[in-house]
């Protein structure tokens, strides 16, 4: 008989290489039986995982699995790092493996003026 525990299917040491300035959806695959659990995302800062409260999230339901999605619109250089999703189920906290975003800044400092320089052109 299949387990009715909540399961989070993020692979151990999974990574995503993404570009700053474009959108990205980070998916947490969630398997549950009856009631959908409360799921949150957090970002690792050393040994603590800081809950992402002001970020846009959504659910995508598929036949055999659901996805809790963290939206990046767009990806920022500061989004580089490791993330984890967690589910609250029957007073139990289930945590996923961490998944890492490797963000490439497509406008590196060498080829791109700062916002202040750009703004000064705006005012010129």
């Amino acid at each position: 008989k299949e387990s009715c525990d909540v399961q989070l299917y993020i692979k151990r040491q999974s990574e995503h290489s993404i570009l700053a300035g474009d959108p990205f959806e980070l998916e947490c695959p969630v398997k549950y039986c009856a009631n959908r659990p409360h799921v949150t995302w957090c970002k690792l800062n050393g040994t603590t995982c800081v809950k992402l409260e002001d970020r846009q999230t959504s659910w995508k339901e598929e036949k055999n699995i659901s996805f809790f999605i963290l939206h990046f619109e767009p990806v920022l250089p500061n989004d580089n790092g490791s993330y984890r999703c967690s589910a609250n189920f029957q007073s139990n906290l289930i945590e996923s493996h961490s998944t890492t975003l490797r963000v490439t800044d497509v406008k590196s400092a060498s080829e791109r003026p700062s916002k202040d320089e750009m703004a000064s052109r705006f005012w010129a």
Partner: antibody, heavy 120, light 106 residues
Framework: QVQLKESGPGLVAPSQSLSITCTVS????????VHWVRQSPGKGLEWLGV???????SYNPAPMSRLSISKDNSKSQVFLKMNSLQTDDTAMYYC??????????????WGQGTSVTVSS | QIVLSQSPAILSASPGEKVTMTCRAS?????MHWYQQKPGSSPKPWIY???NLASGVPARFSGSGSGTSYSLTISRMEAEDAATYYC?????????FGGGTKLEIK
């Protein structure tokens, strides 16, 4: 020098479609996103959608079913198409460049806008 | 969607007076942008990410806030500051603007 310039029809009949072109210079559409924002006396400033550098789009869910944004990177042009216009779509339509810093995203350069009136 | 409510809608200030306008969000946002618009012109970026002045903006302007409450302050009002100021959130789609505060000079 960064510039964005909108060109539109000015007058559109009710139930017809609207097409506006935004021609940009001073930056590449493969590096920066371009947004569409409209301003009407009744609704104030309203974000409509964005064409991201990689070619994906995001839309405001309210008018999304009537909106389409596309681009031609080689011509440095972004296009807004809106179907089934009604009188409350009368507004000034702006194309706006989006840019990111380390930890935030903002719209920095605005076009001068193109005025669209929906009337028979 | 996140609704941004600006108050007051209209504000009249004398030269040299301190001016504060507020922007309240219906849900918590990460940061707030502010734009200035004068009649017949496009909006101009004025304050980025709550407190960073856009280049060319006089130092008498400042921004502050967090969560659902943000404000723009002018330490000493000048005639050239008369304009409409809009707050704008980039935390959740649809990315919304406030209704604006029209600042007039007495």
């Amino acid at each position: 020098q960064v510039q964005l310039k909108e060109s539109g029809p000015g007058l559109v009949a009710p139930s017809q479609s609207l097409s506006i072109t935004c021609t940009v210079s001073g930056f590449s559409l493969t590096t920066y996103g371009v947004h569409w924002v409209r301003q009407s006396p009744g609704k104030g400033l309203e974000w409509l959608g964005v064409m991201w550098p990689g070619g994906r789009t995001s839309y405001n869910p309210a008018p999304m079913s009537r909106l389409s944004i596309s681009k031609d990177n080689s011509k440095s042009q972004v296009f807004l198409k809106m179907n089934s216009l009604q009188t409350d779509d009368t507004a000034m339509y702006y194309c706006v460049r989006g840019d990111y810093e380390y930890d935030y995203y903002a719209m920095d350069y605005w076009g001068q806008g193109t005025s669209v009136t929906v009337s028979s | 969607q996140i609704v941004l409510s600006q108050s007051p809608a209209i504000l009249s200030a004398s030269p040299g007076e301190k001016v504060t306008m507020t922007c309240r969000a219906s849900s918590s946002v990460s940061y707030m942008h502010w734009y200035q618009q004068k009649p017949g012109s496009s909006p101009k970026p004025w304050i980025y990410a709550t407190s960073n002045l856009a280049s060319g903006v006089p130092a008498r302007f400042s921004g502050s806030g967090s969560g659902t409450s943000y404000s723009l302050t002018i330490s000493r009002m000048e005639a050239e500051d008369a304009a409409t100021y809009y707050c704008h959130q980039w935390s959740s789609n649809p990315y919304t603007f406030g209704g604006g505060t029209k600042l007039e000079i007495k």
